[in-house]
């Protein structure tokens, strides 16, 4: 089995997590995709999902989560806006393929949200609704209730030994384990 890897993103309250999950275009383009959180000792919990069948480049907003599935590029974009400390955790993208188990996409995202000061350079996009100008989508195609019964095992972060080109955006602690994310004032 492929070893699950994770990327660590360290952000401040009010900022936006903006990530992508890639998938095999020919196989999963119109499949329903979901964003899940994995809590220690629990089964993954689905927080948001695309419509079924998934619509191309059509943003689906569930609370502070916005999903956009770019069929023609084989990419699911996930944004979590106005982050809160309690959003910290391990996340993953999955593709629903009933009756089979959901297909997990790499990488998993280890999100660490720390306290920030509103209105300072460490803060970002404090207003959820005005930021993206996306009319809230009432997701009629509800997310399937089942979750993967697999045992949740956490792999260590990938080696980032040769990572170069630092992008100076956020004060970081351990650069080898953390993805640097831009601060938008």
């Amino acid at each position: 089995a492929t070893k699950l890897t994770e990327e660590k993103y360290e952000l401040k309250e009010g900022q936006t997590l903006d990530v992508k999950c890639d998938y095999t275009l020919e196989k999963f383009a119109s499949s329903q995709k979901a964003w899940q959180i994995i809590r220690d000792g629990e089964m993954p919990k689905t927080l948001a999902c695309t419509e079924r069948p998934s619509k191309n480049s059509h943003p689906v907003q569930v609370g502070r989560i916005i999903l956009e599935d770019y069929h023609d590029h084989g990419l699911l974009r996930v944004r979590m806006v106005n982050l809160q400390v309690e959003d910290s955790g391990l996340y993953q993208c999955v593709i629903y393929q009933p009756p089979k188990e959901p297909h997990m996409l790499f990488d998993r995202i280890r999100l660490v949200v720390t306290k920030g000061f509103s209105g300072t350079p460490g803060s970002n996009e404090n207003s959820t609704q005005n930021v993206y100008k996306i009319p809230p989508t009432t997701t009629k195609a509800l997310c399937p209730l089942y979750t993967s019964p697999r045992t949740v095992t956490q792999a260590p972060p990938k080696s980032t030994a040769d990572v170069s080109t630092p992008d100076s955006e956020i004060n970081l602690t351990n650069v080898t384990d953390i993805i640097r994310v831009p601060v938008f004032n």
Epitope: D22, L25, S57, I109, A161, D162, V163, S164, I179, F184
Partner: antibody
């Protein structure tokens, strides 16, 4: 040394295919997307598509769909871009460029190959 | 697709001048904008990412600003080695598109 080294210039006939290689060194190849950008003589930059070297998944713009194939060999840190059914308007310099981390929506290209000139002529 | 319109398409300035190039997006791209410099016969080189962040190793005379649909790229004091074509590029959604370029010459 962090760099992308591309294969040499090619001359092809209309209808043929070309496969351009891009060898990465000095960084972890599987951690960053590889993008392909082309530039016709005296023209601007045109993004063709991307590839995640870790998963092997890729995507391209509608214009090239069905004609472009992006692959990689992780054991030797090489990305490939193959363009088929060549026509004269495909004559251009083809660049590979490193994108952001594979999981990040950061589409900036901070490292470029020198480019490969592909000439399509009968 | 989002269209990126740069202006002017070409300009001529003297060494020491302040040079400004603008990039207009056809829709709101927030700060998802990068600037590149391309010297004749060379590959492009990233100068500014996320609208205003200076890439490592790039001289501080280069700067960027803007948000939404209007962006500005500035060279505070033009140097002879700045002769090049400059491009903006958005990544607010896919496909990624570049501006048509601004060719900068020295008077």
């Amino acid at each position: 040394q962090v760099q992308l080294v591309q294969s040499g210039a090619e001359v092809k006939k209309p209808g043929a295919s070309v496969k351009v290689s891009c060898k990465a060194s000095g960084y972890t190849f599987t951690r960053y997307d590889i993008n392909w950008v082309r530039q016709a003589t005296g023209q601007g930059l045109e993004w063709m598509g991307w590839m995640n070297p870790q998963s092997g998944n890729s995507g391209s713009v509608q214009k090239f769909r069905g004609r472009v194939t992006m692959t990689r060999d992780t054991s030797i840190h090489i990305a490939y871009m193959e363009l088929s059914s060549l026509r004269s308007e495909d004559t251009a310099v083809y660049y590979c460029a490193r994108g952001g981390y594979t999981s990040s929506w950061r589409w900036y290209f901070d490292l470029w190959g020198r480019g490969t000139l592909v000439t399509v002529s009968s | 697709d989002i269209q990126m319109t740069q202006s002017p398409s070409s300009l001529s300035a003297s060494v020491g001048d302040r040079v400004t190039i603008t990039c207009q997006a056809s829709q709101d791209i927030r700060k998802h904008l990068n600037w590149y410099q391309q010297k004749p016969g060379k590959a492009p080189n990233l100068l500014i990412y996320d609208a205003a962040n200076l890439e490592t190793g790039v001289p501080s005379r280069f700067s960027g600003s803007g948000s939404g649909t209007a962006f500005t790229f500035t060279i505070s004091s033009l140097q002879p080695e700045d002769i090049a074509t400059y491009y903006c590029q958005h990544y607010a959604n896919l496909p990624i598109t570049f501006g048509q370029g601004t060719r900068l010459e020295i008077k």
